[in-house]
């Protein structure tokens, strides 16, 4: 198992928009109708003012207006609930679809896209109803931007919640080569398909994607738990052809000062179609972006049961070196290299300030309330609440595959 | 090496009840979704019931919907299948399969229980 | 829902003999660039065993002999030089579009 690595199953909290655990003051919009439907009426299943935020321009055909969610601390976000306008129950305004921006630093803004590369959601069918989606991927963010949409001029109107847990990893990005497509009886695509940063000549910087989305994969690498996605998804890989330096190098940076006990690399080991897991990791550390780097590089081996073609999670100890960016070499010992998840064991130095985009001021962890109950969706059939952290007898809901 | 060991099958009268359950190893459970696939005496296979790797997605064909119910216990690595209103065409040999949710089908399966719904 | 239906319901094939096996959907199973077609070997009194996954990907531990085609509608299971084990029934199955069918299976046997 992946000690430290976050599970999706048991962040699915309410965040706070529903219960006010998120202040008037975190939740903002583009413009408002009216200062009874102001960006503050945009609760889940609440009936403050006229019922909704309700913009003051036409989304037809700008797509410009939205609702701003700032949740102070980087989140993972995994799924959006939307509404219409109550209005005491005579409100006719909803928005059949949407799309989602996010941002971690409130300065650079990412579209959200589903798996497909599709960033248009559908919305709700009717004002009261409460439509649940479910982010595949999910975001990691700080501030979260609701963009109704409309295929002609009318009213749209919105109350929303999101759902999710406190981003405890405190990674803001990773670099890494831009994974490749193995060629078997049809092409595997081992490239981070979700990655949400940049790309220049064959590198990928400044972001997070598949390495950090919670998602492990499968034994056989050609197979994923996710419907409908294309042979390799749940895996970034590269071939040892195109490293003549013999190993993959990565850089990670982190929201503040840590020492570091572990790295969780989860690696695909199907040697009889060339992946194999790394010979060794030698990782670097330092403590802000222009440093040197500090000491000498922490370096692992890999020994255990090679043959052995499961997939697993191999623990590099990083000794508790603190930095706030490390750097780690993956040697290759077969063909191929293939991962699909990367995380940490480490704990704050304290003391340390927030790095720009990283963390902010004190919030709680933990699920700031209950969920909602009873919501209809498009693209889901609920069976009771929406989600909450997975236990036994919470709900579970039907999914149309179609 | 994977194993799927399906329980609780027998005889019920129409309109009754049962509960399966899939007792799983030799694979990490919660990385996989899980299904249930019936055989009925004529052969013809149906899928019956589809779950996601953490439990909170579910499937059902419209021939069952309302009266099974999918679940799963991570921590017990067990699957299970409740089962109400029986019908007579609902007898079949049930197995138990990991997969479905997925893009590859359903890879390992279970060697199956017999229900018999009859008065 | 989509239909399968595969062909011929029974074959009888010499040891040492190809044998193939199709399935036609009633409409197309591809998404995304890929066909969500799979293919099951059951032998008598035991479970369904997966063969071939997504038309053409071979599965772990299975020989060589076993191979899968096509595209969209038209899918093909082919066994090169068959063997006194491959006698079973054939299944086809699209995981494209709920509710996932299966096919009404061929039944394989040694002429």
């Known amino acids: 198992d992946m000690k430290g690595h976050f599970d999706p199953a048991k962040c699915r909290y309410a965040l706070g928009m529903q219960d006010r655990t998120i202040p008037d003051s975190d939740i903002s919009a583009s413009s408002s109708w009216s200062d009874s439907t102001a960006a503050r009426h945009s609760r889940l299943e609440s009936s403050d003012g006229d019922g909704a935020w309700c913009p003051a321009g036409s989304v037809f055909p700008k797509e410009e207006e939205y609702l701003q969610v700032d949740l102070q601390r980087l989140h993972l976000v995994a799924l959006v609930g939307t509404q219409g306008r109550h209005a005491g129950g005579l409100g006719k305004e909803f928005s059949r679809s949407y799309r989602l921006r996010y941002s971690r630093d409130g300065r650079r803004w990412m579209g959200w896209k589903d798996r497909w590369g599709q960033e248009v959601i559908s919305g709700n069918e009717d004002p009261e109803g409460v439509v649940l989606k479910d982010l595949g991927p999910p975001m990691v963010a700080r501030l979260v931007r609701f963009y109704p949409r409309a295929d002609r001029v009318m009213s749209v109107c919105l109350r929303v919640e999101l759902y999710g847990c406190l981003w405890r990893d405190g990674l803001l990005s990773y670099t890494a080569p831009v994974g490749q497509t193995m060629y078997l009886s049809e092409a595997v695509y081992l490239n981070d398909s979700t990655y949400d940063g940049h790309t220049v000549g064959g590198l990928q910087y400044g972001g997070l994607g598949q390495l950090a989305d919670g998602v492990v994969g499968l034994d056989d690498f050609r197979k994923s738990q996710e419907l409908r996605v294309w042979p390799g998804y749940d895996y970034v890989g590269w071939s040892n052809h195109s490293f003549s330096s013999g190993y993959v190098e990565m850089e990670f940076e982190f929201d503040r000062l840590r020492a570091f006990q572990a790295m969780q690399v989860h690696c695909n080991n199907m040697h009889t179609l060339g992946a194999r897991l790394p010979g060794g990791v030698e990782c670097r550390f330092r403590r802000g972006p222009a440093m040197a780097w500090e000491g000498e590089p922490m370096r692992h081996n890999l020994g255990g049961n090679l043959g052995d073609p499961r997939a697993r999670a191999v623990s590099v100890p990083l000794g508790g070196r603190v930095a706030r960016f490390l750097q780690c070499r993956f040697l290759f010992a077969g063909p191929w290299l293939l991962f699909s998840e990367i995380s940490f064991i480490s704990d704050v130095v304290n003391n340390s300030s927030p790095a720009l985009g990283g963390t902010f001021p004190p919030a709680p962890w933990w699920p700031p309330g209950p969920p909602p109950t009873n919501f209809s969706s498009l693209e889901l059939e609920p069976r009771g609440q929406q989600p909450v952290a997975k236990a036994e007898g919470s709900p579970t809901i039907e999914f149309r595959m179609d | 090496e994977v194993q799927l060991v399906e329980s609780g099958g027998g005889l019920v009268q129409p309109g009754g009840s049962l509960k399966f359950s899939c007792a799983a190893s030799?694979?990490?459970?919660?990385?996989?979704?899980m299904s249930w696939v019936r055989q009925t005496p004529d052969k013809r296979l149906e899928l019956v019931a589809i779950?996601?790797?953490?439990?909170?997605?579910?499937y059902y064909p419209d021939s069952v919907k309302g009266r099974f119910t999918i679940s799963r216990d991570n921590a017990k690595n067990t699957l299970y299948l409740q089962m109400s209103s029986l019908k007579s065409e609902d007898t079949a040999i049930y197995y138990c399969?990991?997969?479905?949710?997925?893009?590859?089908?359903?890879?390992?399966w279970g060697q199956g229980t017999s229900v018999t719904v009859s008065s | 829902d989509i239909v399968l239906t595969q062909s011929p319901a029974s074959l009888a094939v010499s040891l040492g003999q190809r044998a193939t096996i199709s399935c036609r959907a009633s409409?197309?199973?591809?998404?995304?660039?890929?066909?969500?077609m799979h293919w099951y070997q059951q032998k008598v009194g035991q479970p369904p065993k997966l063969l071939i996954f997504?038309?053409?990907n071979i599965e772990s531990g299975i020989p060589a002999r076993f191979s899968g085609s096509g595209s969209r509608t038209d899918f093909t299971l082919t066994i090169n030089s068959v063997e006194a084990d491959d006698v079973a029934t054939y299944y086809c199955?699209?995981?494209?579009?709920?509710?996932?069918?299966f096919g009404g299976g061929t039944k394989l046997e040694i002429k």
């Open positions: 399969a990991r997969g479905g949710y997925g893009n590859y089908g359903m890879d390992y």
């Open positions: 030799g694979f990490t459970f919660s990385s996989y979704g």
């Open positions: 779950i996601n790797s953490h439990g909170f997605s579910t």
């Open positions: 409409e197309s199973v591809d998404s995304y660039g890929n066909s969500f």
């Open positions: 997504r038309a053409s």
């Open positions: 199955q699209q995981s494209n579009e709920a509710p996932y069918t």
